[in-house]
Interface confidence: medium
């Protein structure tokens, strides 16, 4: 593994993909989505210590300034680097429609 | 302003662009950057309450699940939506070079 992928806080504690099982009710979608009934939501969760999966130069700057001014500048944050698409079948006035969302499920994560 | 741009926590408390004045030493760049000597670093700082500058569907999901499971799912995070380029004059083995970085200064912010 690259140095930037080795978590200094211990296994699984740093920024990585997690799966959270959610119903349409959990998501607040029950009134407009028919299918799927349940979603395995993949999202990015975990700490972003120095040099861990830094997305870009901005993340490096942010970490350096966070160490200098922790009360002013927050640490980088674990967010999706890319997404997986998902199709939802939605209720419409006339019946149902097929809609693909490209920004719904996280595919991989980095620190920004 | 759109509803998603009105901060319910009070003016300036939600996710927005901040400017932090930093020297090359602050940034850890003193050994490889010649110019500029100081940088007005623009970065995204602030809270991401419900419906505030949600970047996409994923951010909506994350907020809904955060409200349900706050110990498991963190709230969305304030990160750059786009960047401004910046030119650095760098030291090289043979002298100096001009390098443009496209991912250094945040241009605007959203919640993911």
């Amino acid at each position: 593994a690259r140095n930037g992928d080795r978590c200094p806080l211990g296994p699984g504690r740093c920024c990585r993909l997690h799966t959270v099982h959610a119903s349409l009710e959990d998501l607040g979608w029950a009134d407009w989505v028919l299918s799927p009934r349940e979603v395995q939501v993949t999202m990015c969760i975990g700490a972003c210590p120095s040099q861990f999966r830094e997305a870009n130069m901005h993340a490096q700057i942010k970490m350096n300034l966070h160490r200098l001014k922790p009360d002013t500048v927050p640490a980088p944050c674990c967010v999706p680097a890319s997404y997986n698409p998902m199709v939802l079948i939605q209720k419409t006035d006339t019946g149902v429609s097929l809609q693909t969302y490209d920004d719904l499920l996280a595919k991989d994560c980095h620190c920004v | 302003a759109r509803n998603g741009d009105r901060c319910p926590l009070g003016p300036g408390r939600c996710c927005r662009l901040h400017t932090v004045h930093a020297s090359l030493e602050d940034l850890g760049w003193a050994d490889w950057v010649l110019s500029p000597r100081e940088v007005q670093v623009t970065m995204c700082i602030g809270a991401c309450p419900s419906q505030f500058r949600e970047a996409n569907m994923h951010a909506q999901i994350k907020m809904n699940l955060h409200r349900l499971k706050p110990d498991t799912v963190p709230a969305p995070c304030c990160v750059p939506a786009s960047y401004n380029p910046m030119v650095l004059i760098q030291k090289t083995d043979t002298g100096v070079s001009l390098q443009t970085y496209d991912d250094l200064l945040a241009k605007d912010c959203h919640c993911v």
Partner: antibody, heavy 118, light 107 residues
Framework: QVQLQQSGPELVKPGASVKLSCKAS????????INWVKQRPGQGLEWIGW????????KYNEKFKGKATLTVDTSSSTAYMELHSLTSEDSAVYFC???????????WGQGTTLTVSS | DIVLTQSPATLSVTPGDRVSLSCRAS??????LHWYQQKSHESPRLLIK???QSISGIPSRFSGSGSGTDFTLSINSVETEDFGMYFC?????????FGGGTKLEIK
């Protein structure tokens, strides 16, 4: 594990109707959609339609409107497809397919062979 | 309706060969294309979703690529169990449509 068990082969006369079944097990029936797909001998696959088991909402390929009727019985975790006014063109293998993400077909039944002949 | 055209109709190969199967859409479908394998007298089996995403339990020798109108399913070292029919399917819009299939046979 997810399983879809389809009813046995059918031999029916032209003009008649037939009702094919697809019994689901290994998962919560209302959590997955059921699609029906037609395959004629030596030919490709045709999507017939989709049904949402929780409340029976369905969507049909226009080509099969009036030909196929999709229903579900949640108490027995079974999906049904009734085919009407049968002709030799309806002779085919019919598959039910369960989908989690409604874009593609994760789980398939073994297929039911329908022969329409006098 | 979106028409998917698969080529070649038949592909004769030797085990160990690397093969590429093509699927072309009549209009852009982004990457909303999925691949299935069907052996004789069996049900189809999902191999690849969304043009290039792998499916749990499917051997890593199967891979997919492409977007827009042109897609490819690759098998990097064909095994005897891989012979059969291969179909592509689009989910860009209803009605879902399938390609006519490519038959992979032993040379």
């Amino acid at each position: 594990q997810v399983q879809l068990q389809q009813s046995g082969p059918e031999l029916v006369k032209p003009g008649a109707s037939v009702k094919l079944s697809c019994k689901a097990s290994g998962y919560t029936f209302t959590s997955y959609d059921i699609n029906w797909v037609k395959q004629r001998p030596g030919q490709g696959l045709e999507w017939i339609g989709w049904i949402y088991p929780r409340d029976g909402i369905s969507k049909y390929n226009e080509k099969f409107k009036g030909k196929a009727t999709l229903t579900v019985d949640t108490s027995s975790s079974t999906a049904y497809m009734e085919l009407h006014s049968l002709t030799s063109e309806d002779s085919a293998v019919y598959f039910c397919a369960g989908t989690y993400d409604p874009a593609y077909f994760d789980y398939w039944g073994q297929g039911t062979t329908l022969t329409v002949s006098s | 309706d979106i028409v998917l055209t698969q080529s070649p109709a038949t592909l004769s190969v030797t085990p160990g060969d690397r093969v590429s199967l093509s699927c072309r859409a009549s209009q852009s479908i982004s990457y909303y294309l999925h691949w299935y394998q069907q052996k004789s007298h069996e049900s189809p089996r999902l191999l690849i979703k969304y043009a290039s995403q792998s499916i749990s339990g499917i051997p890593s020798r199967f891979s997919g690529s492409g977007s827009g109108t042109d897609f490819t399913l690759s098998i990097n070292s064909v095994e005897t169990e891989d012979f059969g029919m291969y179909f592509c399917q689009q989910s860009n819009s209803w009605p879902y449509t399938f390609g006519g299939g490519t038959k992979l046979e032993i040379k």
